[in-house]
Amino acid sequence: SQVSQNCHNGSYEISVLMMGNSAFAEPLKNLEDAVNEGLEIVRGRLQNAGLNVTVNATFMYSDGLIHNSGDCRSSTCEGLDLLRKISNAQRMGCVLIGPSCTYSTFQMYLDTELSYPMISAGSFGLSCDYKETLTRLMSPARKLMYFLVNFWKTNDLPFKTYSWSTSYVYKNGTETEDCFWYLNALEASVSYFSHELGFKVVLRQDKEFQDILMDHNRKSNVIIMCGGPEFLYKLKGDRAVAEDIVIILVDLFNDQYFEDNVTAPDYMKNVLVLTLSPGNSLLNSSFSRNLSPTKRDFALAYLNGILLFGHMLKIFLENGENITTPKFAHAFRNLTFEGYDGPVTLDDWGDVDSTMVLLYTSVDTKKYKVLLTYDTHVNKTYPVDMSPTFTWKNSKLPNDITGRGPQ
């Protein structure tokens, strides 16, 4: 049914879906705080621009009676139930923030005539790619895939002189929501990653992973997995690892590697960690003070979602344009706006661009050090440490196939 939008006459409302099923086990109060802090900033920015308007958020809570798993497994219908709630109340804002689960976002996008923008902190899966009115403020799987292919092909760096074409992917089904969709994308036979690799096998059992570490007949030296150092330790423990094994640990939303006094444990020496560059001041900001290192990005995405709406609202109001039009709904892409902690860039499809950072463990200092950065916006790798103190022979990353000569 046609739902009227509270989005005119100087009063602009944001509908925030507060779903029990969420991409991260974050208490709703941290998201509530993020939204409200974002609103304060937006009001200030609009006021400074001479725009005397009201901006508010309406939090839409799930009743939680049916969809009680607390994770994304039962989120498909929860999102639709909340939309039905909005529809019944005839109360829709100018923009919808949430949901974060890929299942629910995909279903909501499919089952609604979206004449309003949807901003998501999550929705990592490939099934949410290329959606015309969906904006994703946390790195989706497609961005990860493009980095990996780029890095695999790279062979002209002092520390990486071989291009790679093989990989194992460890995926045991217990992953967090972000990891689940990242690994799902790598596993998919039709994905860009699979298309570009000559050999790729998914390891689903702990024992399979453990056996590969010392298997002389392994088909690749490279293993991709997703999670934090503790997750790796549970799996690998203190087992011996062949000297030319490289583990790529995808841990995008975890700032702990950059915190002071963090020492890399010994089991991380064969590991390259892929994470996101932390914001300039986010580690010490009042906003993130009450958040654990793995949760900052999620709450920040909610906050930045509010700031993005404020940015678009300002542009449209200054141009005298209507907010409740398809033009507004399709405008949340191919732009840069001022986020909480600096500029945030969205690509042509409304997905956030970021700087990914590949870290290694220095054998000298036992500290995490930046090996290279990757700009998802231009799909380009920038080496940082030209002479890394690797554990690998000659301080170079090994070939991906044992015994194969230079490419």
């Epitope: 507060m18 086990a25 208490p27 009680n68 798993s69 654990s292």
Partner: antibody, heavy 118, light 110 residues
Framework: CQSVKESGGGLFKPTDTLTLTCTVS????????MNWVRQTPGKGLEWIAI???????YYASWAKSRSTITRNTSENTVTLKMTSLTAADTATYFC????????????WGPGTLVTISS | AYDMTQTPASVEVAVGGTVTIKCQAS??????LAWYQQKPGQSPKPLIY???TLASGVSSRFRGSGSGTQFTLTISGVECADAATYYC????????????FGGGTEVVVK
Amino acid sequence: CQSVKESGGGLFKPTDTLTLTCTVSGFSLSSHRMNWVRQTPGKGLEWIAIITHNSITYYASWAKSRSTITRNTSENTVTLKMTSLTAADTATYFCAREDSMGYYFDLWGPGTLVTISS
Amino acid sequence: AYDMTQTPASVEVAVGGTVTIKCQASQSISNWLAWYQQKPGQSPKPLIYRASTLASGVSSRFRGSGSGTQFTLTISGVECADAATYYCQQTYTNNHLDNGFGGGTEVVVK
């Protein structure tokens, strides 16, 4: 030593406005969420309001229309103002700090008794 | 609203016995639940947070468990000093609340 202490309790008349102050020491208000909780005689705990480290405020649904929570970081105080008092507001009012991760209320004041009677 | 229902309202237990208090959330709060002990004339004292983590200085006789909507506080080897009222509290949301605390359970030690 970290502490919180409530003041401003006493005897009030129905329709009066109540202003309670929570004075904190040994920690910064900009690092913690601060709460007001009350307990009517012989009854359970009832959450009233919270102010976050960024001065964002939330209220229990029953308290929203007649309560205001504010803070003064330079004076290390958190204030609760409640209007249109009735006999049902007779209670001991506690100020409580939420721990830095938001897990629980880790520091409580001794409470201040508020009695509403004509 | 995220309502918390505590049972029983009152329970008697002999010294050395075990008491179990239940707390139910009207919808999932993951493990964002705390337990408090309050004695007459005193302010509440934190016992457990994140459903199962003991607060500083609390005896290991107190044990919290559960997640989602069902939670339990178990006191084993009950002592006279455990006579008090116990409250559960959700710490999951601030914005959608009538209260946040359960109704309380009075533990009487015989």
